[in-house]
């Protein structure tokens, strides 16, 4: 059920998952000079049921220079969930941003975590694309990608998004202006044929990434 590859990369765009499906794993990685505490968790796991999901385990990092592994303890995932829920009801938080059923929110930062978070997505996970600052979107379809299982293999759908510099005015034939992504999917859910279009961009991630979930690192 784990997705084999990373979501596709689009030039001048960035993607994020706004919520993570149950079964998603997040490696507990620490930044240079720090390491996981002794007997600390290797990963966090999104678990739960249709009404309540949360991250099992917690990530904790300690200085590599110290032999003593005592560290300010981070809250258990349940405490983290409760704290975040409370904040959601505070005046500075929107009330309509509740978690999707069967999904976990982005875990709050932990001390001295690695710069990149390494997630292991499951089938059905969706990621959302946006053009980075200084670029605007030209697209014909959803600016999102979904991990799907097709004939026993996983693949990510191709987001129909092109990001162009703000000063450029070129548009697709027949397209008046960039619009919000329509609900419809640009490809069949059942077809096994995956065609490469002009919009398909090769991923820029290294193809020789380690397969172990604990050693995979993004560049």
């Amino acid at each position: 059920e784990l997705c084999d590859d990373d979501p596709p990369e689009i030039p001048h765009a960035t993607f994020k998952a706004m919520a993570y499906k149950e079964g998603t794993m997040l490696n507990c990685e620490c930044k240079r000079g720090f390491r996981r505490i002794k007997s600390g968790s290797l990963y966090m796991l999104c678990t739960g049921n249709s009404s309540h999901s949360s991250w099992d385990n917690q990530c904790q990092c300690t200085s590599s220079a110290t032999r003593n592994t005592t560290k300010q303890v981070t809250p258990q995932p349940e405490e983290q969930k409760e704290r975040k829920t409370t904040e959601m009801q505070s005046p500075m938080q929107p009330v309509d941003q509740a978690s999707l059923p069967g999904h976990c929110r982005e875990p709050p930062p932990w001390e001295n975590e690695a710069t990149e978070r390494i997630y292991h997505f499951v089938v059905g996970q969706m990621v959302y694309y946006q053009c980075v600052q200084g670029y605007r979107a030209l697209h014909r379809g959803p600016a999102e990608s979904v991990c799907k299982m097709t004939h026993g293999k996983t693949r990510w759908t191709q987001p129909q998004l092109i990001c162009t510099g703000e000063m450029e005015t070129s548009q697709f034939p027949g397209e008046e202006k960039p619009q919000a992504s329509p609900e419809g999917r640009p490809e069949s859910e059942t077809s096994c044929l995956v065609t490469t279009t002009d919009f398909q961009i090769q991923t820029e991630m290294a193809a020789t990434m380690e397969t172990s979930i604990f050693t995979t690192e993004y560049q």
């Epitope: 706004m18 929107p94 930062p109």
Partner: nanobody, 130 residues
Framework: QVQLVESGGGLVQAGGSLRLSCTAS????????IGWFRQAPGKEREGVSY????????YYIDSVKGRFTISSDFAKSTVYLQMNNLKPEDTAVYYC???????????????????????WGKGTLVTVSS
């Protein structure tokens, strides 16, 4: 547990200046957008400014452009908001917030404007009198 601690708020006359600080000890700044929201009494919260830890890209809401400047000192785990030429309409509680960057260290201002942040501070009150 990373916590966000704001300081620097206070009472100032219109046209005056304040510098807000947000300290986030232990935060890996390179993986986050860090910045400020504000909420005035009876008004909706709005994203004022952020700076990305990956490439120091900055964003400002239109109403503060040219008056506010965001900067960072990662060595001190602190982000600053220098607020000049303050106006009575800048009166609000200012909250520090962080949001995880997207793939390849990218970030989109629409994510900040959505207000769906990963972590919030408790806020510091800024009052601008006329």
């Amino acid at each position: 547990q990373v916590q966000l601690v704001e300081s620097g708020g206070g009472l100032v006359q219109a046209g005056g200046s304040l510098r807000l600080s947000c300290t986030a000890s232990g935060l890996t700044f390179e993986g986050y957008a860090i910045g400020w929201f504000r909420q005035a009494p009876g008004k909706e919260r709005e994203g004022v400014s952020y700076i990305t830890g990956s490439d120091a890209s900055t964003y400002y809401i239109d109403s503060v452009k040219g008056r506010f400047t965001i900067s960072s000192d990662f060595a001190k785990s602190t982000v600053y908001l220098q607020m000049n030429n303050l106006k009575p309409e800048d009166t609000a509680v200012y909250y520090c917030a962080v949001d995880r960057l997207g793939s390849r260290g990218g970030y989109a201002s629409s994510w900040w404007r959505s207000g769906d942040m990963d972590l919030w501070g408790k806020g510091t009150l800024v009052t601008v009198s006329s």
